[in-house]
């Protein structure tokens, strides 16, 4: 028709102006489109230039979009660790604080000439629960062999105890249980609820990394073409009016975010197994009743320790001989007063219970957040025709999109009409991506089942560090030696230093 | 056997820095604090400050404060200690030391000299 | 901080005498915190007597220590040659950590 020859381009100058290109790239009348190599090749108001310019904006359209998504996703996990990260420690700081203002009344010397002993339980609790790759039950007993040697001294001034009579009774200390049952209660839901809430917090950091690594995965040329020709073809061809119909646009984003769609299946294993580690947080070995209650397991110790100070010391003598009376010292120290002791079941402050309804219902928000992300952007971003009729943009012209829709993942873009992809070839950041899903899933299953992990950095390689039981030195064999390990970096942030006295203290 | 070997000598300018080592060994590294200690001739032995190798928590006196900087590498059981701005005063023999359990030094190094001259 | 003054700073002593270091602590310390370390020409202190009272491994039995509150002391019940050092007190009571200015004993 003569006529559509010389339609003007006044509609495409508009839209190509506002984009901020140069008007003097725009024909006034149709050409004929012979040199388009993505677009129809029709009449056209584009050139080979204003075609290209196109193609660049629509693919950088689409990767903001997709960043756009992903920055809400990330920034909700963002704040969920922070809310969480923020309450566990506050439980863990607010056991100190209170061990502090309340054990120098309750225990005098057995507790102020042991302070740095308490200190550093404190601290490597702390740092435990940020990830670092520390042996809690190690931990623990190490606290409290070196505990008990102390205060069995304090307990007996009168006595010379030389290192080897101090080591005689820390070979005994299994055996005697000096400090009855809190060091073994402790250790059992001390393990359960630390590794309960430092998986669930490191769950939140993991999603979070995939989500910021996926958002930087480029989009393919095969996907740009695809995109140029939903979003500005319409233009070109002199129907600027036509809006994409809608299968149309779901089947050009499904094949541009095939790769992406295949997370799908682990992330949502991940979500419910973090949704399903959130039971763990609550009941008398749950995270808040135990993290915040530290304190009161080490002042049940400290009193079994000096109601059974007869007994023990009768053992000790039993087990490793009778030490030499100290010509200079005091008398056997007085039994103190007991230590009045805080109710072990901290009253919940509802706190906890609201951070996690929240949590669960966003992240239930969010499970199908990679296979609804082309709906999502198509519906959001692409200014869809409202109907699939046929006065839609199918890609060629306005009119009815017959093909079917593809379904989700790479698998299933074998026969994509839109965009030619590769199925052969998957996105190795995705992969890698999606094996740190695996992972952390499965950290937070053995989490559930009260298990400690050894935890590995979610690296950007995709590669982990196994661990050995090889041998560092020779106190390996000892029941109390600190497995010699690398604390991996927090999570989130260290904690100010503190100062003590003259000393001052940095972290 | 526990063991706790310090770098060699040190001759250094006036205003440089040295960072000088303790490597330990014979113990589980994270298991004990390790301490520095200065020696010299006018005053006697210094406590300069601690470092928990496991938890990375240092303590310094406040009077070395500004001067050293404690560290430690838990792959090769090693701890170190950097002094800063040198001037004469700093020329002494420095010492790491392991103590036992919160009580004492139970364990030295060997000392390292440094020698501040222009 | 807690201030340690070590008399005499320098002594000697004959062979089979009996030899008393003290040490008085410008505040009160529990005796647990309480060391004394050897320390001859060229080499590391080495831990002597710590707690007050106990012995360092290897230590002879001629030493003992005693004390309580801000006064202490190392006593040597018969001086041999061997002993000539330089003996230091130590408290571990608060920080910083802080050391006697030492006691240089000689055998005449």
């Known amino acids: 028709d003569p006529a559509s020859k010389s339609r003007s381009c006044g509609e495409v100058r508009q839209i190509y102006g506002a984009k901020g290109f140069s008007l003097s790239d725009v024909p006034q009348a149709e050409i004929s489109g012979e040199h388009l190599r993505i677009c129809p090749q029709g009449y056209t108001c584009c050139t080979s230039e204003m075609e290209e310019n196109l193609a660049n904006r629509s693919h950088a359209e689409l990767e903001t979009a997709l960043r756009d998504s992903s920055r809400v996703l990330q920034a909700m996990l963002a704040t969920q660790l922070r809310s969480f990260d923020d309450h566990f420690q506050h439980l863990l700081n607010d056991s100190e604080r209170t061990l502090q203002a309340t054990f120098p009344g309750a225990f005098g010397e057995l507790y102020t000439q042991n302070a740095r002993a308490f200190r550093d339980l404190y601290s490597e609790l702390r740092l435990y629960y940020r990830g670092a790759n520390l042996h809690l039950e190690e931990t623990l007993a190490e606290f409290w062999a070196r505990l008990l040697e102390r205060l069995f001294k304090q307990l007996h001034p009168q006595l010379l105890l030389p290192d080897d009579y101090l080591d005689c009774l820390g070979k005994q200390a299994e055996a005697l249980r000096p400090f009855g049952e809190a060091p073994r209660e402790l250790r059992l839901r001390a393990t359960r609820a630390f590794v309960a809430a430092r998986s669930f917090v490191q769950g939140l950091g993991v999603a979070s990394d995939v989500v910021r690594k996926v958002a930087q995965v480029p989009l393919g040329p095969e996907c740009s073409r695809a995109v140029m020709k939903l979003v500005y073809c319409a233009h070109c061809l002199g129907v600027p009016g036509a809006r994409p119909c809608p299968d149309y646009c779901r089947n050009v984003l499904k094949g541009c975010l095939a790769n992406q769609a295949d997370l799908d299946a682990e992330w949502r294993n991940l979500l419910d197994s973090m949704v399903l580690i959130t039971d763990k947080f609550w009941g008398t070995s749950g995270v808040e009743s135990v993290i915040g209650s530290v304190h009161t397991w080490l002042a049940e110790a400290i009193n079994a320790l000096q109601d059974n100070r007869d007994t023990l010391t009768a053992k000790v003598i039993q087990g490793c001989g009778n030490p030499k009376v100290n010509p200079q010292g005091p008398g056997p120290e007085e039994k103190r007063r007991r230590g009045k002791l805080a109710p072990r079941e901290r009253p919940p402050s509802g706190t906890l219970e609201k951070l996690v309804s929240e949590a669960k219902a966003q992240l239930r928000d969010v499970q199908d957040f990679w296979i609804s992300l082309p709906g999502t952007l198509c519906s959001e971003k692409m200014a869809l025709s409202t109907a699939s009729d046929d006065r839609c943009w199918n890609g060629m012209a306005r009119g009815r999109y017959l093909p079917e829709v593809m379904g989700d993942g790479l698998a299933n873009q074998i026969n994509n009409p839109e965009v030619e992809v590769d199925i052969t070839k998957p996105d190795m950041t995705i992969r890698q991506q999606i094996m740190q899903l695996k992972i952390m899933t499965n950290r937070l299953r053995s989490a559930y089942n009260g298990n400690d992990v050894d935890f590995q950095d979610a690296s950007d390689d995709g590669s982990g560090s196994g661990s050995g039981d090889g041998c560092l030195d020779d106190l390996c064999s000892r029941k109390v030696s600190r497995k010699s390990s690398s604390s991996r970096t927090p999570l989130t942030h260290a904690l100010p230093g503190l100062s003590e006295q003259e000393g001052q203290k940095t972290s | 056997e526990v063991q706790l070997q310090q770098s060699g000598p040190e001759l250094v300018k006036p205003g440089a820095s040295v960072k000088i080592s303790c490597k330990a060994s014979?113990?589980?590294?994270?298991?004990?604090?390790i301490h520095w200690v200065k020696q010299s001739p006018e005053k006697s032995l210094e406590w300069i400050g601690e470092i928990n190798p496991s938890t990375g928590d240092i303590t310094y006196n406040q009077k070395f404060k500004a001067k050293a900087t404690l560290t430690v590498d838990k792959s090769s059981s090693t701890a170190y200690m950097q002094l800063k701005s040198l001037t004469s005063d700093d020329s002494a023999v420095y010492y790491c030391a392991r103590e036992r359990n919160y009580d004492r030094f139970a364990y030295w190094g060997q000392g390292t000299l440094v020698t501040v001259s222009s | 901080s807690i201030v340690m003054t070590q008399t005499p700073a320098l002594m000697a002593a004959s062979p089979g005498e009996k030899v008393t270091i003290t040490c008085s602590v410008s505040?009160?310390?529990?005796?647990?915190?309480l060391h004394w370390y050897q320390q001859k020409s060229e080499t590391s202190p080495k831990p002597w007597i710590y707690g007050t009272s106990n012995l360092a491994s290897g230590v002879p039995v001629r030493f003992s220590g005693s004390g309580s509150g801000t006064s202490y002391s190392l006593t040597i019940s018969s001086m041999e040659a061997e002993d000539a050092a330089t003996y230091y007190c130590q408290q571990w009571s608060s920080y910083p950590l802080t050391f006697g200015a030492g006691t240089k004993l000689e055998i005449k």
């Open positions: 505040s009160s310390i529990s005796s647990s915190n």
């Open positions: 014979g113990y589980s590294f994270t298991g004990y604090y």
